[in-house]
């Protein structure tokens, strides 16, 4: 027989097919010009010493072929024996190690046979209806196809699935898309209605992540709060590596998965913008705000779940940076301002509420006043820190108020509100005989002594009724009893006490009348 | 030794908080990770969250949002977990747990705290 | 979630002879974040094996576990009484997911 053509003869070989998982497959036959064929295929295993012969039977039963030698692509024209107009059987036999191994047939009309390409290109992936959907433009002069797709995870194999047919100059298909596993997709095409026509090769893998992307395992820490008021986030996470089938190992493009940082400053909720989602790389410094925290994981279709962490405010407080002073038409913050050109927030919530309860206001930007300090004023009016009770206060300042991430703490401190002096005044005084010269004089605490750091001192007055002197005690905020001596028995004394805090003096409570009893002796 | 000692069993009513203590001892207090897992009668173990004791920072479990409150107490070594809203299905152990490196390597003996009207 | 499935939901078997107890994930638990609990009447649980197969302070050589991406492995080499337990595997590689238990009793 002549090379070039197909040989009408029994093959140089035993014919029985070993059945083993090795072999040729995927053969594929197609007219490449007016007059020339061309059938290609592929062979899996190890391929030393393999022998290909190219099979063809015709309609009429007559069988022949062409010895391709270790060659897996084989050239003949419409002379060489093979009917081109009729329909044909075709099959590749590969002769090794003493044993022939066998491809699928594939029955086709050559001359009517067309190469298909497989989509070539971008292949655009989209999420539709919890489905995935593929598009690609329709290679040139190929409208008209058949599509199948093939789909693997990292621990599942091939499957395949139909994409339906496709006459357009675009092509798409629908496929199922796993929520938590990344595949690799593989499309390939063929003449649409062409009775047996060769599918083309599988296309270039298309690497899909997982509808949910995986969510890093993390920790967050902070820094104390700094002089400048500021404390530094700090992140530690699990490297966490989403598994890929074989084909999109190394560079998978399509699979990336993005990690971001979402940060809401509780705290201060009349500012302008609360939330700031930065790179994860870059960790920022927060103030001493509270703070919800989350770790956002994205891939092309979205972000997935997140898992919330709180900050909670920093409550160091500051005993004495903040002067309040109240005045007739007012009430007149004072404290050390932080630079040129800022903007303080002022925030205040009654102790042991819920911290839902802030109220706040932003000042304009301000300079410092000639002794360096900034100033925060409220009408008597505006009710605010109007009730006689504690307030924890906090200031926060900011050159960039609309920059979440530069927001510093100037103070933390307690204030009681309304009319404190009057408020504070301590009720319940008592006095007990203490002993012949002194008494025992006790009063229930100040509301005052419930605002940390607002207590400076309590006072105890003495009046000797007779000779109108008057005795001041001071006693710490931490004690509720003083012991009066030096007394003289029969004399008529009052007895007050007052609350002070750092800026205002206490109302004395009202005068409590006492005297010691002269004692007679038998 | 290196130890969580868990507050005693408690008994609530249906809508009721229950506030369970682990105190902590044996190493230094902030350079741990405390989480809490309940087991009810008869059943596996669930994880409800964790608390950062250096800063309090604090992460729960999506289930528990809104009805646990996990806390620290730094002068006592103290981690503290508060649930809120109970109700029948909450009637488990809970167990605090230290994490070493992301598993828990420690455990406190558990607290029952049972839900009953 | 990452669900784990343990199998057989109970073991019998005698002192002396080995314990094999499974542990699938629904999805791959990412860089072998598997760690093994083992749990005695009333008592916390305790930290056997982390990382998949890394034994904790103080457990036994006779406790070993293997196993990567959705399938993992408790073996007990020579089962001694106090071993009788219920054995928890536990993820913790995507928050924390814990299997449902396989309880080992004395056949």
């Known amino acids: 027989c002549r090379t070039s053509e197909c040989c009408f003869q029994d093959p140089p070989y035993p014919d029985a097919d070993s059945g083993s998982a090795s072999g040729p497959r995927d053969l594929r036959c197609y007219r490449i010009s007016s007059d020339r064929y061309e059938c290609s295929w592929q062979y899996e295993g190890p391929t030393a010493g393999v022998s290909h012969f190219l099979r063809c039977c015709l309609s009429s039963g007559r069988c022949c072929y062409f010895a391709a030698g270790s060659a897996t692509r084989l050239q003949f024209s419409d002379q060489a024996g093979v009917s081109v107009l009729y329909t044909v059987t075709l099959w590749v036999e590969s002769w090794a190690r003493n044993q022939t191994e066998k491809s699928p047939e594939v029955t086709l009309q050559l001359y009517n046979s067309v190469k298909y390409e497989p989509p070539l290109g971008d292949i655009k992936v989209s999420k539709l209806a919890g489905q995935l959907r593929m598009e690609w433009e329709t290679p040139d002069n190929q409208v008209g196809a058949e599509v199948q797709f093939r789909h693997r995870t990292p621990s599942s194999p091939w499957k395949l699935g139909d994409c339906g047919p496709q006459d357009d100059d675009t092509e798409s298909c629908l496929c199922p898309l796993e929520m938590n596993v990344a595949q690799e997709f593989q499309l390939r095409r063929r003449q649409l209605g062409s009775q047996g026509s060769s599918w083309s090769k599988w296309s270039s893998p298309v690497c899909v992540p997982p509808e949910n992307p995986p969510q890093p395992q993390v920790r967050f820490s902070v820094e104390q709060l700094g002089q400048d008021g500021r404390r530094r986030l700090t992140l530690k996470e699990q490297p966490t590596q989403l598994e890929l089938p074989e084909g999109c190992q190394g560079l998978a493009p399509g699979t990336e998965v993005t990690y971001r940082l979402q940060l809401h400053m509780l705290s201060c909720p009349c500012k302008a913008k609360a939330t700031r989602t930065l790179h994860l790389g870059k960790m920022p410094y927060l103030s001493g705000a509270a703070y919800n925290v989350a770790v956002i994981s994205s891939n092309q279709f979205g972000p997935g779940l997140n898992q919330t962490w709180h900050i909670p405010a920093d409550t160091h407080t500051e005993p004495v940076a903040l002067n309040i002073s109240v005045g007739t038409n007012g009430t007149t913050m004072y404290w050390p301002a932080r630079a040129q050109s800022m903007t303080y927030c002022i925030e205040w919530q009654p102790v042991g509420q819920d911290g839902g309860l802030a109220t706040c206001s932003l000042t304009a930007p301000q300079d410092p006043d000639p002794a360096g300090m900034a100033t925060y004023s409220w009408s008597r009016e505006s009710g605010a820190m109007g009730q006689e009770k504690c307030y924890y206060i906090t200031i926060f300042a900011s050159a960039h108020p609309e920059k979440l991430t530069l927001w510093s703490t100037v103070l933390s401190t307690y204030h009681f509100g309304g009319n404190a002096s009057a408020a504070g005044t301590p009720h319940h005084v008592s006095v007990k005989n203490h002993s012949l010269d002194s008494v025992s004089v006790d009063w229930a605490p100040s509301l005052l002594s419930t605002c940390p750091g607002v207590l400076k001192e309590y006072v105890v007055r003495c009046r000797d009724e007779d000779s109108k002197q008057v005795s001041e005690h001071p006693v710490q905020p931490t004690e509720t009893q003083v012991t009066l001596s030096g007394l003289r028995a029969g004399v008529a004394y009052t007895v007050q006490v007052r609350a002070d805090t750092a800026w205002l003096r206490g109302v004395w409570s009202q005068p409590q009348r006492f005297s010691i009893e002269v004692q007679v002796s038998d | 030794q290196v130890q969580l000692v868990q507050s005693g069993a408690e008994v609530k009513k249906p809508g009721a908080s229950v506030k369970v203590s682990c105190k902590t001892s044996g190493y230094t207090f902030t350079s741990y990770y405390i989480h809490w897992v309940r087991q009810a009668p008869g059943q596996g173990l669930e994880w409800m969250g964790i608390i950062n004791p250096s800063g309090g920072i604090t992460s729960y479990a999506q289930q528990f949002q809104g009805r646990v409150t996990m806390t620290r107490d730094t002068s006592t070594s103290t981690v503290y977990m508060e649930l809120s809203s109970l109700r029948s299905e909450d009637t488990a152990v809970y167990y605090c747990?230290?994490?070493?490196?992301?598993?828990?390597?420690?455990w406190g003996r558990g607290t029952l705290v049972t839900v009953s009207s | 979630e990452i669900v784990l499935t343990q199998s057989p939901g109970t073991l019998s078997l005698s002192p002396g002879e080995r314990a094999t107890l499974s542990c699938r994930a629904s999805q791959s638990v990412s860089s072998s974040y598997l760690a093994w609990y083992q749990q005695k009447p009333g008592q916390a649980p305790r930290l056997l094996i982390y990382g998949a197969s890394s034994r904790a302070t103080g457990i036994p050589d006779r406790f070993s576990g293997s196993g990567s991406g959705t399938d993992f492995t408790l073996t007990i080499s020579r089962l001694e009484p106090e071993d009788f337990a219920v054995y928890y595997c536990?993820?913790?590689?995507?928050?924390?997911?814990f299997g449902q238990g396989t309880k080992l009793e004395i056949k």
């Open positions: 536990q993820q913790y590689g995507s928050s924390y997911t």
């Open positions: 747990a230290r994490e070493g490196d992301w598993y828990f390597d420690l």
